[in-house]
């Protein structure tokens, strides 16, 4: 993959109710079929029209699902993860990791072992510092006029 892709990683709790059309999404991943290199996590591969997830609008294709009703999805076979969802009942609480690409480059997913994902504060702190320096320089310049 050419270039470097950086991500803002955020987590969210999403509560869905399995309606008559179901939760309405598909998953990939698991220890037996890694979707992302060096990461056996469970990812959303497809969101179906009219399902609870699509109607809610927060879950996105490519999101990583960390837990279902408080149960961790780490180190599960794909089918075990599927079964966990299918047995989760009507009220389903998902802990989800969204990854937002913040720099131009090829779109891709980051494995857990890849350090290119950067926390939001590491972007905001330098931006804030630069803004303050620019403001200070501007004020000094005005005083000299």
């Amino acid at each position: 993959m050419n270039g470097r892709v950086d991500y803002l990683v955020t987590e969210e709790e999403i509560n869905l109710t399995r309606g008559p059309s179901g939760l309405g999404f598909n998953i990939v991943g698991g220890t037996d079929q890694q979707y992302v290199s060096n990461d056996s996590g469970i990812y959303v591969s497809r969101i179906k029209e009219n399902g609870a997830a699509a109607l809610d609008g927060r879950l996105q294709e490519g999101d990583k699902i960390l837990s279902v009703n408080g149960q961790d999805l780490k180190n599960l076979l794909h089918q075990d993860a599927v079964d966990l969802f299918r047995n989760a009942g009507y009220a389903v609480s998902l802990r989800v990791q969204h990854r937002l690409q913040v720099q131009n480059g090829p779109i891709g997913h980051r494995g857990e072992g890849d350090p290119s994902g950067i926390p939001i504060f590491m972007v905001l702190v330098p931006v804030f510092a630069l803004t303050m320096v620019a403001a200070w320089a501007f004020m000094r310049y005005r005083q000299q006029l």
Epitope: G22, L23, V28
Partner: nanobody, 124 residues
Framework: DVQLVESGGGLVQPGGSLRLSCAAS????????MGWFRRAPGKEREFVAA????????DYSDSVKGRFTISRDNAKNTVYLQMNRLKPEDAAVYYC??????????????????WGQGTQVTVS
């Protein structure tokens, strides 16, 4: 996408038997969840039976339990629906469906991504 072709439908007397087949192509068959649904004229689409990919576990609607049997032959990329003791209310167009990785139960139509064209079953 998965291409599905059903066969085996036809006209049968009440109490008779039919065996439907659904041949799949387009991706690794053994990992696919496979289901049968039916639609009678003027009625909603109804779940009939399903068989999961990795474990081969089966599920049936209450209306066909004990009379219908779903099975699969991964070597032939085919799923079957053996229908015994057929009743007039079993008459419908029967559709084969395939899906992978759905978080919903196999009785939900939304769990399936690909559908066949259907085969007609008439009981009279």
């Amino acid at each position: 996408d998965v291409q599905l072709v059903e066969s085996g439908g036809g006209l049968v007397q009440p109490g008779g038997s039919l065996r439907l087949s659904c041949a799949a192509s387009g991706r690794s068959f053994s990992s696919l969840d496979m289901g049968w649904f039916r639609r009678a004229p003027g009625k909603e689409r109804e779940f009939v039976a399903a068989i999961s990919g990795s474990r081969g576990s089966t599920d049936y609607s209450d209306s066909v339990k004990g009379r219908f049997t779903i099975s699969r032959d991964n070597a032939k990329n085919t799923v079957y629906l053996q229908m015994n003791r057929l009743k007039p209310e079993d008459a419908a167009v029967y559709y084969c469906a395939a899906g992978f990785g759905s978080v919903d139960g196999l009785e939900y139509p939304i769990s399936y991504d690909d559908w066949g064209q259907g085969t007609q079953v008439t009981v009279s």
